[in-house]
């Protein structure tokens, strides 16, 4: 029961995490204009991995995509790559983990196969989470560096009176979404790896032992251990896992043809 719960929770946490990584990657607010001494601005700039946007006080918002590939900073390209790798690994991990879930029966899949799949998806989630955290952290580092560089030459004089105020950028909402999402995916992956240990079949085989009493021939097969751990074919236990411990949302999430309640 604990293994199934750990596996299920790991899957859900990873699912939320990967959804968050996708959301962060698509978000426009990776960096936002620093409003240091002017909290009310007529023109507000913010940038994402794919486009930069300007929101005017008038309510008008204009976004422009980065249509060049070679002209973009190498760091931005690296961040994009890390986030995409994170999403791809996470998506594959989700696909693998769906089939690895204890509560879903596909044909006569062995427990050892499910354990291997759980471990594989767990590792994928861990790498996916690390990619997202790395990507967001690289971008954050880039922002911090640029922030202090622009602060150093905040006002560049242009012939006495005239001033050019340099726009400084600070952390946007996407960074925090990315960090949290990466962390969740990582935690989910660890949970899947922990669940894998419990899913692996026991090495010791409890063979049937015959006890011969005088006058009667009664064979006693101890099946209690297997039944209590939930790894046996005890239908009563199976019903609890499949029916009782599942929410309506989970029922919708998995195709009915794989459910044997």
């Amino acid at each position: 029961m604990a293994v199934t719960a750990c596996q299920g929770l790991g899957f859900v946490v990873s699912l939320i995490g990967i959804a968050g990584i996708i959301a962060a990657t698509c978000m426009d607010q990776w960096s936002t204009q620093d409003l240091y001494n002017n909290p009310v601005t007529a023109v507000f700039n913010y940038q994402g991995l794919w486009r930069s946007c300007v929101r005017e006080s008038s309510g008008f918002t204009e976004c422009r995509g980065y249509f060049t590939l070679l002209g973009l900073p190498a760091m931005l390209q690296a961040v994009r790559a890390l986030m995409i790798v994170g999403i791809v690994l996470g998506a594959i991990g989700l696909l693998v983990s769906i089939f690895a879930l204890k509560c879903i029966r596909i044909g006569s899949m062995e427990d050892s196969a499910k354990a291997n799949m759980t471990l594989t998806s767990g590792i994928m989630f861990i790498v996916s989470g690390l990619c997202a955290i790395a990507g967001v952290s690289v971008f954050a580092n880039m922002l911090v560096t640029n922030f202090w560089m622009s602060t150093a030459n905040m006002y560049t004089g242009m012939g006495g009176m005239v001033q050019t105020v340099q726009t400084r950028y600070t952390f946007g909402a996407a960074l925090f979404v990315g960090w949290v999402a990466g962390g969740l995916t990582l935690i989910g992956g660890v949970m899947m790896c922990i669940a894998c240990r419990g899913l692996a079949p026991e090495e010791t085989n409890y063979k049937a032992v015959s006890y011969h009493a005088s006058g009667h021939s009664v064979a006693y097969k101890p099946g209690g251990f297997k039944a209590s751990t939930g790894f046996g074919s005890n239908t009563k236990n199976k019903k609890i896992y499949d029916g009782g411990a599942r929410t309506e949302d989970e029922v919708q999430s998995y195709p009915s043809k794989h459910d044997y309640v």
């Epitope: 007529a42 700039n45 008038s58 309510g59 008008f60 050019t164």
Partner: antibody, heavy 118, light 113 residues
């Protein structure tokens, strides 16, 4: 089409408060855009005073400090300007306006002339 | 606050003539985010509110004749009327649309010779 109409007193005594109303038709003030107050002195100089955001938050010209306040009544589709402790320097034509692309003002009221005199 | 300086304060012209008026800001009105200059031009006739002519320094508002052209970048801007008509004789203002408080120039008065 969007129309704005200012209303308020023609004459205000010094040290008193000036209250102006802008009635908007053809668009909801809580729908979108920012709604502004601008004044024009007798010598034609224009000065931006304040704005009321569609969300209800406001922003003021810092030169007025705590002398100015802006509010609204969404049920009547009106927004208001209050200027406290007026002096003869506040004699001007007061306009309400709605912002447009580029933070420009496309829609203006006809303006109301307010004279501050004892 | 950004100070807007308009020159000349008045211009005497003849119909059909090309007219140029200038506006200078104390700070750059260029926004690197969208590569646009936040300067607006208005025309005002006596007893009327200002009328929007040009925003983003060079974008003509719909209904504005194409004889009106806005140009410039950063801190120096120009409004050009290619061939002045009698109805163009009025006051012209430039406005800082880049940062609060929004500020206006003192205006350029266009008069007939």
């Amino acid at each position: 089409d969007v129309q704005l109409q200012e209303s308020g007193p023609d004459l205000v005594k010094p040290s008193q408060s000036l209250s102006l109303t802008c009635t908007v038709s053809g668009y909801s003030i809580s729908g979108a855009y920012n709604w502004h107050w601008i004044r024009q002195f007798p010598g034609n100089k224009l000065e931006w005073l304040a704005y009321m955001q569609y969300s209800g938050s406001s922003n003021y010209n810092p030169s007025f400090k705590s002398r100015i306040s802006i509010s609204r009544d969404t049920s009547k589709n009106q927004f208001f300007l209050q200027l406290k402790s007026v002096t003869t320097e506040d004699t001007a034509t007061y306009y309400c306006a709605r912002m447009y692309n580029g933070n420009s003002f496309l829609y203006w009221g006809q303006g109301t002339l307010v004279t501050v005199s004892a | 606050d950004i100070v807007m300086t308009q020159s000349p304060s008045s211009l005497t012209v003849t119909a059909g003539e090309k007219v140029t008026m200038n506006c200078k800001s104390s700070q750059s009105l260029f926004n690197s985010g969208n590569q646009k200059n936040y300067l607006t031009w208005y025309q005002q006739k006596p007893g009327q509110p200002p009328r929007l002519l040009i925003y983003w320094a060079s974008t003509r508002e719909s209904g504005v004749p194409d004889r009106f052209t806005g140009s410039g970048s950063g801190t120096d801007f120009t409004l050009t009327i290619s061939s002045v008509q009698a109805e163009d004789l009025s006051l012209y203002y430039c406005q800082n649309s880049y940062s609060y408080p929004l500020t206006f120039g003192a205006g350029t008065k266009l008069e007939l010779k």
